[in-house]
Amino acid sequence: VSLRIQEGCSHLPSCCPSKEQEPPEEWLKWSSASVSPPEPLSHTHHAESCRASKDGPLNSRAISPWSYELDRDLNRVPQDLYHARCLCPHCVSLQTGSHMDPLGNSVPLYHNQTVFYRRPCHGEEGTHRRYCLERRLYRVSLACVCVRPRVMA
Amino acid sequence: VSLRIQEGCSHLPSCCPSKEQEPPEEWLKWSSASVSPPEPLSHTHHAESCRASKDGPLNSRAISPWSYELDRDLNRVPQDLYHARCLCPHCVSLQTGSHMDPLGNSVPLYHNQTVFYRRPCHGEEGTHRRYCLERRLYRVSLACVCVRPRVMA
């Protein structure tokens, strides 16, 4: 498959495979390799409740527990991203694992992740149009963290 | 700049810019766009000590505080990654912000992130060798999380 650097995608170089109607098989193979969330997705009840478990994956044992929500985009590499959703407003007590402690806040940790979008190349028309790979930063919540509330000066 | 998909890089399609001795300017622009860590890098003392601050970035206010360590690879996109390094073995008390609570462990949250490496294409020799863009999963520690210790069955 022939490619070329395309400067037209937000001034970022990118790769433009030639195609007919649909992007080539290469794109499918490249983009669809699945990326799991940092912790295995748990479908058990406790992963969705405001409590800190004594077993299971990290996100359910944390005193700032969270669940993962899928963000799937067929035009993006990676195709699947996961967003952490905090299950409690405050941290769970280390003693009980269930009661919340108002001294601590459970807050999401955000990160701008590098992703790549498939875009039609500028100035390409007709059925044999090429695609650009456009680099972008995409905000995801990675985890929930138990923090001491910020003291305002 | 002419490119092509190269199947030889770990059986993943990739983009091979032609080059003379050095990677093209496009690669440099593409790969070096800096990606910050999730929280601003703090060079103040408390970000490097085992205590939970009442101000500053999330990683220093967490009761499982961590610092960021730079992982720079000029042949990778993104060029800069950051690894979280836990500053305490146990979680810090929400009351004091300094004393450790043995009821909680401070543990790193790992994630396999999609990255791309620049590789010489298979079967390319001489001064006009091309480069492949090879997709890989790369393990990074995203943050440190306060968890209840796992109970062994």
């Epitope: 499918l28 669809s32 963000d71 799937r72 985009d73 035009n75 195709q79 498939r118 039609p120 | -």
Partner: antibody
Framework: QVTLKESGPGILQPSQTLSLTCSFS??????????VGWIRQPSGKGLEWLAH???????QYNPALQSRLTISKDTSSSQVFLKIASVDIADIATYYC????????????WGQGALVTVSS | QIVLTQSPAIMSAFPGEKVTMSCSAS?????MYWHQQKPGSSPRLLIY???NLASGVPVRFSGSGSGTSYSLTISRMEAEDAATYYC???????????FGGGTKLEIK
């Protein structure tokens, strides 16, 4: 050749559960990137996305209707199912199933539609 | 939730005339899709990923736009193009597919 065909009860009473089946051919729902979705259209009105199911059994729902919807699939028999609980007259519409993917989020193939009426 | 507003709601054109219809998003979207629906028939995908022609669609159809403003153009209107046209977008998180209210195109 890709084809999709919807089937359902045609008519049902308020508060009953609507069960719809989409039978498809010409593609496999085990292929990476492939999905099948449900869209409905009240007579003379616009289109409303309800739900879809992906090749890896990930299910996604319209938040406004999520509590009433259940989507599932049988890959081996090339069928996708949609259940809508507690129907009322607002659910009277033509229900379409459509393929999504494998490389974009348009709906390149649609079924002919199944008209559903709610009447007491 | 993103809302898509199509304009005009109804329009008419002579055969051979150039036709342009708009789709405005309440906030920025990555891609736009366009579907054609004739009375008594299922919708048909015309344009995907903003500007790509779906399989079997005549080249007189084209799509363009970015951000919150998108359009569908028919370079030369034909009688068979009389239909209702829907724009469609999706957001990956939270997942939501949204359709515009439609533009009804009639032949003069």
């Amino acid at each position: 050749q890709v084809t999709l065909k919807e089937s359902g009860p045609g008519i049902l009473q308020p508060s009953q559960t609507l069960s719809l089946t989409c039978s498809f051919s010409g593609f496999s729902l085990s292929t990476s990137g492939m999905g099948v979705g449900w869209i409905r259209q009240p007579s003379g009105k616009g289109l409303e996305w309800l739900a879809h199911i992906w090749w890896d059994d990930v299910k996604q729902y319209n938040p406004a209707l999520q509590s009433r919807l259940t989507i599932s699939k049988d890959t081996s028999s090339s069928q996708v199912f949609l259940k809508i609980a507690s129907v009322d007259i607002a659910d009277i519409a033509t229900y379409y199933c459509a393929r999504i993917g494998p490389v974009h989020h348009g709906f390149p193939y649609w079924g002919q539609g199944a008209l559903v009426t709610v009447s007491s | 939730q993103i809302v898509l507003t199509q304009s005009p709601a109804i329009m008419s054109a002579f055969p051979g005339e150039k036709v342009t219809m708009s789709c405005s998003a309440s906030s920025s979207v990555n891609y736009m899709y366009w579907h054609q629906q004739k009375p008594g028939s299922s919708p048909r995908l015309l344009i995907y990923d903003t500007s790509n022609l779906a399989s079997g669609v005549p080249v007189r159809f084209s799509g363009s736009g970015s951000g919150t403003s998108y359009s569908l153009t028919i370079s030369r209107m034909e009688a068979e193009d009389a239909a209702t046209y829907y724009c469609q977008q999706w957001t990956s998180y939270p997942p939501m597919y949204t359709f515009g209210g439609g533009t009804k195109l009639e032949i003069k």
